[in-house]
């Protein structure tokens, strides 16, 4: 198990990258002037206390920005949010911090990120460009939940 966050770049199957705009993550087509965020991911160190066979439980942060992805309810709907948080503080906690955890599943080159706090809800981007990242239960419909990860060293 890694004890240092792994920097990765993420894009969806339509080659859109994640960009930070006004403290919101949006997916935009990769262009010359676009500067995508680098994502840090680290496995939860309490993996034995989480569900088996659902994927690798990970924390997702924005590299160098002290911001992490988390899921919280807005009304009765889970939403994806960015919270000011050091990813290593989450990693070191004595229990899994489920609101910040995602099950990372890989199938070939495709990755999905399912909320641990809200099973069945996945990080997604709308099929239209320039939209914020969201959580969805609707797989493979109007939203894209499959992403490609490139390890950065």
């Amino acid at each position: 198990k890694s004890e240092m966050p792994q920097p990765v770049s993420i894009q969806d199957i339509n080659h859109r990258v994640w960009v930070l705009q006004d403290q919101i993550l949006i997916a935009v087509p990769r262009k010359d002037r676009v500067s995508p965020v680098t994502i840090s991911l680290i496995s939860c160190r309490h993996v034995e206390t989480l569900e088996k066979d659902r994927g690798n439980p990970i924390y997702l942060g924005l590299n160098g920005l002290n911001l992490c992805l988390m899921c919280a309810k807005a009304g009765d709907q889970p939403t994806l949010q960015l919270k000011e948080k050091d990813i290593m503080d989450l990693y070191n906690q004595p229990e899994p911090v489920k609101s910040f955890l995602f099950y990372h599943s890989q199938s070939g080159r495709n990755s999905t990120f399912e909320s641990v706090a809200f099973p069945g809800w996945f990080i997604a981007v709308s099929s239209e460009g320039g939209c914020p990242l969201i959580l969805t239960q609707e797989l493979g419909k109007a939203n894209t939940t499959d992403f490609g990860l490139t390890m950065l060293f």
Epitope: T49, L50, N92, Q93, E95, V97, K98
Partner: antibody, heavy 121, light 109 residues
Amino acid sequence: QVQLVQSGAEVKKPGASVKVSCKASGFNIKDTYIYWVRQAPGQGLEWIGRIDPAIGTTRYDPKFQGKATLTTDTSTSTAYLELSSLRSEDTAVYYCARYDYSGSSFYFDYWGQGTLVTVSS
Amino acid sequence: QAVVTQEPSLTVSPGGTVTLTCRSSTGAVTTSNYANWVQEKPGQLFTGLIGGTNDRAPGVPARFSGSLLGGKAALTLSGAQPEDEADYFCALWYSNHLVFGGGTKLTVL
């Protein structure tokens, strides 16, 4: 408001088993961890273990592995502690507590009122 | 298994300051022990005061603060009130298990 209400006092014979309940209200039991702690007469607190009610995974203090069994029934928002092969030294007040993450750390924010288990022949 | 030791009893004057400590038999307490402090008043439910060494639980008065002091976890009460008379327990994390101290009986006199 948030409450953890435990079952009433029990008197058991050595070798018997006991099951203590802890009913949660005012919050979704699946959104937190439930811890069990005991306090023997005149002693400090002792951690028994914890359960994640959402998925049923448990952690136990090594001393209570095989002695205590933690379960939950999420349909009734109730956590259970079962103790087997009781001995006189298991006489104690048993507490459930919510261990919740709030912003930056985990805290024991709410506790049950305690259940006295007396083991006597 | 680690043993966690607290002062059995302490006395503080109303308005005064007192520090309760929590020592580990395995060596210096660090932030990795994620010290928790809980309060038990006679006839009342336990209340969580501090988590993660120095984070006050929501609703806990600012006169309670947690820290590390000389290799021990510490709970400092500044401006003690009569209602702060209670038993105080610390708990330290050791990898995947939690160990409580024996408690400190605090008298406000």
